[in-house]
């Protein structure tokens, strides 16, 4: 299993660019055989995305050899039974890693697509598949999860309850001799071998067989394309080894014989021998989410999807997270407005990016010589004397409070306020006795004039919580 | 066609918490496009935004309403609930929960038909 | 938190009468204001978005104008279904705020 550059074609670029390491991821897509393989059409029979995928590290200017995929398996669950005729779906994307990555993240590569016969059950099937300069080789299988079994999943077994033989009117559930059929819900005969059901009391068969119990083999005249009937129990084969054989034809186009070699229908969008061509053009609508196409008026000529702000992907088909960069700062929420971003703030907060808290000091001052005090996850206010209010703009009476102690008298004053203490007091608000024995007594101030000393008086009131 | 469909008992006691959940039908509750959001009306006035809450359980409320609110989401249930803390008949409200887009431009485009709970003894 | 007034906070108008009404922010949020109608008993519904923007299906006499603080939401010509009343919210800045109200009612 590989994915490089097909042969003849020259030096092809590798799967990474010059902005350093990539990975491959494969994303595998089962459609319903009968649908169209147009991108847009759903994965209704399932989709899955490759896991554990290598590294690589090539850079342009080396030879991109075809390069080792992982072992690990792509398991693509399907629903209900399974159909035997189906699309197939492989793109291959590309993962850029790296710091300085930049640009698109993620690259749709490659896309091939189709149309496969299969029966479940069966062996591995080999197949290899090109499209622009790269081929693709892969291989592919369906297996029923048990209980089912058969071609189309569609019968169930159950583990024997005795060793050697099934209860009344079961069988043993070939391929699995240790386990039983479970009670049947087709129309009762409806071939085990040949037929399945989706519904109770219904008997539909596989490719080869027809009656209303899928017991007859097809007629030899329904066996197409020069092959002959087969014995009973396997319905028309080959006489031989045929130019279509394996389906040479890439993309899902169609293989038809033509005098000893063969010729390829290509669906739309596909050109070549081997429709192993990519033709998409900008007709074909290839960009999305609302990205512009430019260039691929003809199929000769390489489109590019433009993408609108907030997509990137060669197909604009990846939204990018622009988010995730966590732009916004103290818990703001980040708003991807498409033209822009946009920080959406937590209350408190301000600014482009929420950079600015509205309740600190830093650009918000306090009026009148007040001071800014922060706490508490808020911001205040501590008013001189003489002020008030949130911005101290305000003027207060600074004797309103009746701060002079001990029958001090309060008189307002250009700094704020004087206490005129009562006899036997003193300090700035009367606080202090003065000691009877009058050791420590000061002399006497001329009444009314005895001043608090500013600095003083500021420094307790800066560090004076209210 | 998104669906929001609020629930939760229609009588509440006074200093009891109320207790409401909206499920969203119709859409993934885990989209990276919108933020799920509470938003009551109590009768006769206006409108008043509670909170919101992101799928992966980021959550931004109205500090009005303090450390009363409680938003939580359960994605597998495709539910998000409200829960708000001694209750008081100023709490009596038609409770709405809406759908917000932050991605392209933001509104509430979704919105549930309401549910009124009163707050009585 | 940013304030939202809203005048005239009730009207009376006719139908086929143009009949407009303002918003105010108390501080700027660009065109980050969404218009809502509520009937009663109804839950709100989204009107205009982004200041201007119509929202799908909203018949086009309703247009949104206005940035920064000042805001207009117009009805071209007043219809039946649409007397009710009419929010404004700022989804600029958390905490989210809804302006009081207009109540559109019959002359």
């Known amino acids: 299993h590989s994915f490089g550059p097909g042969p003849g074609l020259g030096t092809p670029r590798s799967p990474c660019n010059a902005r350093g390491p990539c990975r491959l991821f494969f994303r595998v897509c089962l459609k319903p055989g009968v649908s169209q393989e147009a991108t847009e059409s759903l994965c209704a029979l399932g989709a899955a995305l490759s896991t554990s995928v290598p590294v690589y590290t090539e850079h342009p200017g080396e030879s991109a050899a075809a390069l080792p995929l992982p072992d690990g398996l792509v398991r693509v669950p399907f629903r209900d039974a399974w159909p035997g005729t189906f699309s197939l779906v492989i793109e291959t994307w590309r993962e850029q890693l790296g710091e300085h990555a930049g640009g698109p993240a993620w690259n749709l590569l490659a896309r091939v697509v189709g149309r496969r016969r299969l029966a479940a059950g069966g062996p591995w099937a080999r197949d290899v598949q090109r499209t622009g300069t790269w081929e693709l080789h892969f291989s592919y299988r369906a297996r029923c999860e048990p209980p089912a079994v058969g071609a189309a999943c569609a019968r169930l077994c159950r583990s024997r309850s005795a060793p050697s033989r099934c209860g009344p009117g079961l069988r043993p559930c070939t391929p699995f001799p240790d386990e039983c059929e479970a009670p049947s819900v087709c129309r009762p005969g409806c071939s085990p071998e040949h037929g399945y059901c989706e519904e109770p009391d219904e008997c539909r068969c596989l490719e080869g067989w027809t009656g209303p119990l899928c017991t007859v083999p097809v007629s030899t005249s329904s066996c197409l394309n020069s092959r002959v009937p087969g014995p009973a129990s396997t319905g028309c084969l080959l006489p031989g080894p045929g130019p279509c054989d394996g389906n040479p034809c890439a993309n899902g186009g169609s293989c038809s014989e033509t005098s000893g070699s063969f010729e390829c229908a290509c669906p739309r969008g596909f050109y070549g021998l081997r429709c192993e061509v990519s033709g998409v053009t900008c007709a074909d609508g290839p960009c999305f989410n609302g990205g512009l196409c430019v260039g691929g008026e003809d199929p000769d000529s390489a489109y590019v999807c433009h993408c609108p702000p907030g997509f990137q992907g060669s197909n604009c088909e990846k939204r990018v997270d622009r988010c995730s960069l966590q732009p916004c700062q103290n818990g703001g929420l980040c708003l991807d407005l498409g033209h822009a971003l946009r920080c959406r703030c937590r209350a408190g907060f301000a600014g482009p990016r929420c950079e600015h808290d509205l309740d600190d000091c830093a650009g918000r001052a306090c009026a009148n010589g007040g001071t800014c005090v922060e706490g508490g996850g808020s911001r205040r206010c501590s008013c001189a004397l003489g002020f008030g209010g949130r911005d101290c703009r305000e003027r207060a009476d600074p004797c309103a409070s009746r701060p002079c102690a001990h029958g001090g008298r309060c008189y307002a004053h250009f700094s704020g306020l004087v206490c005129a203490c009562a006899p036997g007091y003193m300090g700035v608000r009367c606080e202090f006795a003065v000691r009877p024995d009058g050791a420590d007594a000061v002399p006497a101030a001329p009444r009314g004039l005895r001043q608090a000393d500013p600095q003083r008086f500021l420094h307790h009131h800066h560090h004076h919580h209210h | 066609q998104l669906q929001l469909q609020e629930s939760g008992p229609g009588l509440v006691k006074p200093s009891e918490t109320l207790s409401l959940t909206c499920t969203v039908s119709g859409g993934s509750i885990s989209s990276s496009s919108y933020y799920w959001g509470w938003i009551r009306q109590p009768p006769g006035k206006g409108l008043e935004w509670i909170g919101s809450i992101y799928y992966s359980g980021n959550i931004y409320h109205n500090p009005s309403l303090k450390s009363r609110v409680s938003i939580s989401v359960d994605t597998s249930k495709n539910q998000f609930s409200l829960r708000l803390s001694s209750v008081t008949a100023a709490d009596t409200a038609v409770y709405y929960c809406?759908?917000?887009?932050?991605?392209?431009?933001?509104?509430?485009?979704?919105w549930g038909q309401g549910t009124l709970v009163t707050v009585s003894s | 938190a940013i304030q939202m007034t809203q005048s005239p906070s009730s009207l009376s108008a006719s139908v086929g009468d143009r009949v407009t009404i303002t918003c105010r922010a108390s501080q700027g949020i660009r065109n980050d204001l969404g218009w809502y109608q509520q009937k009663p008993g109804k839950a709100p519904e989204l009107l205009i978005y982004a200041a201007s923007s119509l929202q799908s299906g909203v018949p086009s006499r309703f247009s949104g104008s206005g940035s920064g603080t000042d805001f207009t939401l117009t009805i071209s010509s007043l219809q039946p279904e649409d007397f009710a009343t009419y929010y404004c919210l700022q989804d600029y800045n958390y905490p989210l705020t809804f302006g009081p109200g207009t109540k559109v009612d019959i002359k």
């Open positions: 809406a759908r917000e887009i932050i991605v392209g431009a933001t509104h509430f485009d979704y």
